[in-house]
Interface confidence: medium
């Protein structure tokens, strides 16, 4: 079948409706066509003329068939603590994101007004709730029999290693250290363990399971954007 | 298959009263307006109502308005003409037809028709 | 009279150009309401061939075309063929009588 052709202006009859890509123009009483993306009006329909179209001008866009008279206004230019992840063109506004460590505290329709760093869970702290691009982390104390000896974002509670014969007992805060007889955990024979540099762990992983005697989720601390929490550090 | 199926129509006296039926299939019915259209012995079509999806909004024909109801009830997915007052002049086979869409409103299915003899 | 003016009859042989008017005023074609082009085959009921000035519904041969201009419109039948023989109606809305209105339709023959 061949295109379809669109004789605009027209009048709409009783009951009916504009179609797709045109708008109903109250002075004219008529079926007009609307503008392109990147385009806006500028004059608009009679009754015996259709919509007049012209391009946005740099810094402005409009990213739908639109009629408006002005183009919208490109948003500000991305802060330091966000990347621009999409350009402002004729047809989209500029989108910034928050910048990795960090997550939005207070968003927009498209992209993010204000970033926040992401809350560290201090030594004895482990990450109960990841950050995501929209919420801080959550910490929790540690539970007995695990620990966290980093100040992090990202760092979950560890289980302690179970020693044949313990050196130092673990804490919150501490590993437990073996005697120079192997520990049951896996490690070089005779060697004094210590706690592996978090870094090595993955962002991504689960926390562990905890045993009957850990605190109750009323110890999880607040999302969002409040002031560091026990367990929190600001910087 | 899409489908208008008219009915109802028949033999009346001059000022008696006849209710044609329209059952529609094959589409959702709810989604479009309706019309009646009337087509005397030989002679053209006449447009007599039309009555959008939701039967909020109706329109009538001068010669037919004061004395002809449409309605429709889209749980039976049937559209109605009520006609009272008949006069000669109603004899017409009466078509029932469904607009397309919601922009042009061309009457693009139709059902058979049925006949109303208005005559003493 | 109707309010759309056809006329009443039109013909030629087959294989011609056949064109069909509709005149109306500035209460229907004229305020810039769209034509409907409607045909009829003996003893059957009407068909929509044209909708929305110019465009064909599925199964409509490209044979038929639909034309709008100021205050009329026309239907042009190209490649004329003994099964397009009908009454061809033309439609438009009203301002002034605030219903939907039909030409007095055209009798098409073909010799």
């Known amino acids: 079948l061949p295109a379809q052709v669109a004789f605009t202006p027209y009048a709409p009859e009783p009951g009916s409706t504009c179609r797709l890509r045109e708008y109903y123009d109250q002075t004219a009483q008529m079926c007009c066509s609307k503008c392109s993306p990147g385009q806006h009006a500028k004059v608009f329909c009679t009754k015996t003329s259709d919509t007049v179209c012209d391009s946005c001008e740099d810094s402005t866009y409009t990213q739908l068939w639109n009629w408006v008279p002005e183009c919208l206004s490109c948003g500000s230019r991305c802060s330091s603590d966000q990347v621009e992840t999409q350009a402002c063109t004729r047809e989209q506004n500029r989108i910034c994101t928050c910048r990795p460590g960090w997550y939005c505290a207070l968003s927009k329709q498209e992209g993010c007004r204000l970033c926040a760093p992401l809350r560290k869970c201090r030594p004895g702290f482990g990450v109960a709730r990841p950050g995501t691009e929209t919420s801080d982390v959550v910490c929790k104390p540690c539970a007995p029999g695990t620990f966290s000896n980093t100040t992090s974002s990202t760092d979950i509670c560890r289980p302690h290693q179970i020693c044949n014969v313990v050196a130092i007992p673990g804490n919150a805060s501490m590993d437990a250290v073996c005697t120079s007889t192997s520990p049951t955990r896996s490690m070089a024979p005779g060697a004094v363990h210590l706690p592996q540099p978090v870094s090595t762990r993955s962002q991504h992983t689960q926390p562990t399971p905890e045993p009957s005697t850990a605190p109750s989720t009323s110890f999880l601390l607040p999302m969002g954007p409040s002031p560091p929490a026990e367990g929190s550090t600001g910087d | 298959e899409v489908q208008l199926l008219e009915s109802g129509g028949g033999l009346v006296q001059p000022g008696g009263s006849l209710r044609l039926s329209c059952a529609a299939s094959?589409?959702?019915?709810?989604?479009?307006?309706m019309s009646w259209v009337r087509q005397a012995p030989g002679k053209g079509l006449e447009w007599v109502s039309t009555?959008?999806?939701?039967?909020?909004?109706?329109w009538y024909a001068d010669s037919v308005k004061g004395r002809f109801t449409i309605s429709r009830d889209n749980s039976k997915n049937t559209l109605y003409l009520q006609m009272n007052s008949l006069r000669a002049e109603d004899t017409a086979v009466y078509y029932c037809?469904?607009?397309?869409?919601?922009?042009?409103?061309?009457?693009?299915?139709w059902g058979q028709g049925t006949l109303v003899t208005v005559s003493s | 009279q109707s309010v759309l003016t056809q006329p009443p009859s039109a013909s030629g042989t087959p294989g011609q150009r056949v064109t069909i008017s509709c005149t109306g005023s500035?209460?229907?074609?004229?305020?810039?309401?769209?034509v409907h082009w409607y045909q009829q085959l003996p003893g059957t009921a009407p068909k929509l061939l044209i909708y929305?000035?110019?465009n064909r519904p599925s199964g409509v041969p490209d044979r038929f075309s639909g034309s709008k201009s100021g205050t009329s419109a026309s239907l042009a039948i190209s490649g004329l063929r003994s099964e397009d023989e009908a009454d061809y109606y033309c439609?438009?809305?009203?301002?002034?009588?605030?219903?939907?209105?039909f030409g007095g339709g055209t009798k098409l023959t073909v010799l």
């Open positions: 037809a469904r607009h397309e869409g919601y922009y042009y409103y061309g009457m693009d299915v």
């Open positions: 094959g589409f959702t019915f709810s989604s479009y307006a």
């Open positions: 009555i959008i999806g939701s039967g909020a909004n109706t």
């Open positions: 500035s209460s229907n074609i004229g305020a810039g309401y769209v």
């Open positions: 929305g000035n110019s």
């Open positions: 439609a438009a809305w009203d301002d002034s009588l605030n219903g939907r209105v």
